[in-house]
């Protein structure tokens, strides 16, 4: 008698049964339909340290990592300054509770992000016209 | 692919609490924040606050009076809104969205990424 | 806190035409301006950041312009697609309280013939 479950028809490590009038697939956690071939949980058994989150979708998963880590599993040390989250030239600090920027003379808040006079020039220095939210970092 | 979904919305009674939560996933908290917005059936938008997880930081619109809160758990992927004393003029469609802070030592302030929205109703 | 006014609150023109927004700050906000498209049943849209800049995917026919308290956008060649409301946005810091905000106009309907 062939061994019908030799042509491994279960995807993603599900146990093959041979039931003579059929094959049936026993899916893993995580899997489903009857060849075990959808992803119900692209997260499933994968870990992201240091208090990264897995995140789905599109039959992936990657971990978004804690601000100060980065990696594929968030296991490596990242320089979280290194997005350069200050304006106007403000000094990036990694602390414990979060980022500070430590500001250049003239600007205040918590991203350097205000000139200190409001009654001085009415503009902002210009963004540059390349750069756009959203797009990839250069 | 930056993406932001709202969940939580729904039938609540006036003096109520609802908790909503939005989802966030394909961007760096060290350029961006993230905003709630809320609007009202046939009315303008609203900014209700936003959180700047990388920085600790939270701020509100001064009309909230401490009756929301914004927070964020798991590595900042979930942020949430605490709605607490919810009257009737509170029905709304709520928004999450994210704000581009500051990008590559650029500051922008802008929201660039929203949500579809929670409608939230309080009604007896 | 800032109060954005927005002028007008509606207004018709033909496709091809010129369309200009205008909105008020009650106090200096430098160039925190942004502009959004909302149409029914949708989340709002970016359409202009720091007063000028153009979002992603946005045709040069949207100009942003002002600095300050006076903002204004302008739509050129109108298209039907055009038709929706429209909200700036500032954003503004309080160095007294070290909080930071942001508020919306009220809204200008966009009417397109």
């Known amino acids: 008698r062939v061994d019908r479950c030799s042509l491994q028809p279960c995807r993603n490590g599900g146990l093959c049964l041979d039931l003579g009038h059929a094959l049936r697939c026993r899916c893993r956690a995580g899997f489903a339909g009857p060849r075990c071939e959808h992803d119900l949980d692209d997260c499933a058994g994968r870990a992201c340290a240091n208090g990264g989150t897995c995140v789905e979708g599109g039959g992936a998963h990657r971990c978004s990592c804690a601000l100060g880590f980065g990696g594929r599993d968030c296991r490596e040390r990242a320089d979280p300054c290194a997005a350069r989250p200050c304006a106007h030239g403000g000094r990036c600090y990694a602390h414990f509770s979060g980022l500070v920027c430590a500001c250049a003379p003239g600007y205040m808040g918590a991203r350097c992000e205000f000139p200190v006079h409001p009654d001085g020039a009415s503009a902002l220095p210009a963004a540059p016209p390349g750069l756009r939210p959203g797009d990839p970092q250069r | 692919q930056e993406q932001l979904v709202e969940s939580g919305g729904g039938l609540v009674q006036p003096g109520g609490s609802l908790k909503l939560s939005c989802k966030v996933s394909?961007?760096?908290?060290?350029?961006?924040?993230v905003s709630w917005v809320r609007q009202a059936p046939g009315k303008g938008l609203e900014w209700i606050g936003y959180?700047?997880?990388?920085?600790?930081?939270?701020y509100y619109a001064s009309w909230v009076n401490g009756r929301f809160t914004i927070s964020s758990h798991n590595a900042q992927n979930t942020l949430y809104l605490q709605l607490n004393s919810l009257t009737a003029a509170d029905t709304a469609t709520y928004f999450c969205?994210?704000?581009?802070?500051?990008?590559?030592?650029?500051?922008?302030?802008?929201?660039?990424?929203w949500g579809p929205g929670t409608l939230v109703t309080v009604s007896s | 806190d800032v109060v954005m006014t927005q002028t007008p609150a509606s207004v018709e023109a033909a496709v091809g035409g010129t369309v200009t927004i205008n909105c008020q700050a009650s106090?200096?906000?430098?160039?925190?301006l942004s502009w959004y498209q909302q149409k029914p049943g949708q989340p709002p849209k970016l359409l202009i950041y720091?007063?000028?800049t153009l979002a992603s995917g946005v045709p040069s026919r949207f100009k942003g312009s002002g600095s300050g308290t006076q903002f204004t956008l302008t739509i050129s060649d109108l298209e039907c697609a055009d038709a929706a409301t429209y909200y700036c946005?500032?954003?503004?810091?309080?160095?007294?309280?070290?909080?930071?905000?942001?508020?919306f106009g009220g809204g200008t309907e966009v009417v397109v013939k």
């Open positions: 106090q200096n906000i430098y160039s925190y």
């Open positions: 394909g961007f760096d908290f060290s350029n961006y924040g």
């Open positions: 969205v994210r704000v581009a802070l500051v990008v590559a030592g650029v500051a922008y302030y802008g929201m660039d990424v």
């Open positions: 946005q500032s954003y503004y810091y309080s160095s007294g309280s070290s909080y930071g905000a942001f508020a």
């Open positions: 720091r007063t000028s």
């Open positions: 959180i700047d997880p990388a920085f600790g930081r939270t």
